[in-house]
Structures are given as C-alpha cells and as structure tokens.
Interface confidence: low
C-alpha cells in the first residue's frame, strides 16, 4: 500500500491531523524534500549571525557572521570572534602568539614556526608572530658553484624577529 504522504511535494507536509492531506508549510518553516511529515522551522539569523539567504518554503535560511566574527561548524553553526594576525583566541580573549609561534589569519591558533633544519635547510627569512619562517636552500646547495643564490645573512634557529 502506497504511503499517502509520499505524494506531498517539497514545501508541504503530510498533515496527519487532516487525513494526511498535503498542507503547505506555514510561515517561517520549510520542507526541502517530498513526503515530509513535518516542516522544519526556519533558521533565524539573530545576534552575531546575519542572513546570507532567506528561508523559503523549500529551503532553510543560511547565515553567516557579522563583521568581526567568522563561521565555525557545519552550515555556520557558530560564530567565533576574529583576532588580528599574530594572535589567537583564548577564553580570555585575543592573545599574542607566544615566541616561536605564528598565526597568519584572523582565526585559528598560533602554530610553531617551521624547523628548517629538520629538512636540512637554513632560515632564509626570520619568523614573526604573523608569519612563518622561510626556509632557504640547504647548506650543501650553497657550496661554491652549486647555485647562484645569494647566501642568506646568518640567522638564529628557529628564526625570530624581535617583537
């Protein structure tokens, strides 16, 4: 026996209170597939969320975050405060990256500078709070006649510019 609800298109719900007829989704609700027994309440983009796409009878609203915040989670389920480059967000707010770490984005955590010597390379450009070190050619590549690269100025390992 065919389920009478299977005839209900997107934008409607199978209303058991009314002999399983297909009733349109009421305002502020949607059903994105056919055969639904209930419409879902539209997402409301409130507070730090703002509306990227309005809800329709067949699709949910989509949110993003107000300036100064960025999306986290599937479908922007959370908004997290932006920090500046060179910082990370902690429970106590935005904090500068510790020595030897960097963050080149407004989100995420500070990550350790690359250890050039692990790849047998030298530091070409020192790291900062905002930027990773740039590794140069390996010392072997810098032997006379091996290449025309100008040897870098001596640098400490890991590279660091005074902050």
């Amino acid at each position: 026996l065919q389920d009478p609800c299977s005839n209900c298109p997107a934008g409607t719900f199978c209303d058991n209170n009314r002999n399983q007829i297909c009733s349109p989704c009421p305002p502020n609700s949607f059903s994105s597939a056919g055969g639904q027994r209930t419409c879902d309440i539209c997402r409301q983009c409130k507070g730090v969320f703002r509306t990227r796409k309005e809800c329709s009878s067949t699709s949910n609203a989509e949110c993003d975050c107000t300036p100064g915040f960025h999306c986290l989670g599937a479908g922007c389920s959370m908004c997290e405060q932006d920090c500046k480059q060179g910082q990370e967000l902690t429970k106590k707010g935005c904090k500068d990256c510790c020595f030897g770490t960097f963050n080149d984005q407004k989100r995420g955590i500070c990550r350790p500078w690359t250890n050039c010597s692990l790849d047998g390379k030298s530091v070409l450009v020192n790291g900062t709070k905002e930027r990773d070190v740039v590794c140069g050619p390996s010392p072997a590549d810098l032997s006379p006649g091996a290449s025309s690269v100008t040897p870098p100025a001596p640098a400490r390992e890991p590279g660091h510019s005074p902050q």
Epitope: F13, C14, D15, N16, N17, R18, P26, S29, R37, T38, C39
Partner: antibody
C-alpha cells in the same frame, strides 16, 4: 507567558450536559491545536480530540465521538468542550493542552490546570 | 487504535538508582512516542518527544530510546523530585494513545 486557564469544578446530574472552557493567552491562539484529555479518578490519560482554532477543524477519538463537541471562540481565544448525556463514568478531571501545527512533532507543551467534573445524582 | 503496554505499573527505587520504564506498541509507530511526568493533583508535563528528544528545561538525567515498537524511558539517577507517575504516548496515528502509567516511588 503562555497560559491555559480552565473553568472551575462542576457537579452535574446524570443525563445533563456541561460546557467546559479553556482560555488561552500569551501566544497566537489560532496557530496551535487545542487538545482535550480525560483522566478518571485513579486512572490513566485518554485523548478525547482536538480542534484547530484557525478553521475549527476537529478530530475526535471514536470513543468520545457522541459524547464531546469541541468548539472555539477566536475573539476571546477560548476553546470549549461540551459533554452531553452525562453518566457517572464521565466523572473525571478534564485537561486542555496545546500542540503546535506539525502533528508529527507533537508535544503537549502547555496544559490547563484541569477541570474536575463530578456526575452524581 | 494502537495499544500501548507500559511496564512496570509501579516500581520502588532508591535515591541515586537508575530507573528504566518500558513501553511497547501494538504496531510499528516509528519514533512518534513521547513521555510525560505527572505529579499528584497536577497536569502532566512533557519530558521527551520523538522517542529521544529532550524537551527544553528537562534535566539531562532523563533520556529516551527506541523505535518501532519498543521504547524506554531512563532516569539515570533518581532524585526526590522524580517521584511521580510516568506515561508514554504514541502519536503515529490518530487517536493518540497513552500507556497505562508507571508509578515511581522511593524505596
């Protein structure tokens, strides 16, 4: 805040009728079903029926089809249940309770305080 | 009408004990089952709907499980305020039908 306030206790003679009321406030009355539930003394719960105030669409439990009549007055946000041909087995507490538009996510989320009906000669 | 068989009809448990109440439907009701708590002289209060969705404000010690015909309400650690009668309700089909109730008492 959402409230469902029911009429006071009733004592009725067998064979008579009674009309119980349930006044809603704090929400859009026409957007929620009003359900009626019976609880006989020391017994469990029985669903009598429901009504959608927006268009007065009703559903009844077959058991109560000839016993209960559900109506609403949208102007006063009040739901009514009339019980006819009263007998001693109609003695019970009657609750009104609301469910929202989508039957399959039904939750009786707010309840009236109940009306005690005693049928006695 | 769908019959809902609830067991046990009453139980006595110690404070802090785990309590389990079961409800069996006479036919498949998907997950369209809710649980209610009723204290003496009061209206019932919804705890769980759709078999396992906790109503806002209900303590997390309450949980629901099951689908099809067999369902369970669990109180993970019984508290004094949980003393009440608990009912299941199927709403897969009209008319919605309640289980017979389980009275929970303190041992």
């Amino acid at each position: 805040q959402v409230q469902l306030v029911q009429s006071g206790a009733e004592v009725k003679k067998p064979g008579s009728s009674v009309k119980l009321s349930c006044k809603a406030s704090g929400y859009t009355f026409s957007s929620y079903w009003i359900n009626w539930v019976k609880q006989a003394p020391g017994q469990g719960l029985e669903w009598i029926g429901n009504i959608y105030p927006s268009d007065s669409y009703t559903n009844y439990n077959q058991k109560f089809k000839d016993k209960a009549t559900l109506t609403v007055d949208k102007s006063t946000s009040t739901a009514y249940m009339e019980l006819s041909s009263l007998r001693s087995e109609d003695t019970a507490v009657y609750y009104c309770t609301r469910t929202w538009e989508f039957y399959y996510d039904s939750v009786f989320d707010y309840w009236g305080q109940g009306t005690t009906l005693t049928v006695s000669s | 009408d769908i019959q809902m068989t609830q067991s046990p009809s009453s139980l006595s448990a110690s404070l802090g004990e785990r309590v389990t109440i079961t409800c069996k439907a006479s036919q498949d009701i998907n997950s369209y089952l809710s649980w209610y708590q009723q204290k003496p002289g009061k209206a019932p209060k919804t705890l769980i709907y759709r078999a396992n969705r906790l109503v806002d404000g209900v303590p997390s010690r309450f949980s629901g499980s099951g689908s099809g015909q067999d369902f369970t309400l669990t109180i993970s650690s019984l508290q004094p305020e949980d003393i009440a009668t608990y009912y299941c309700l199927q709403y897969d089909e009209l008319p919605p039908t309640f289980g017979g109730g389980t009275k929970v008492e303190i041992k």
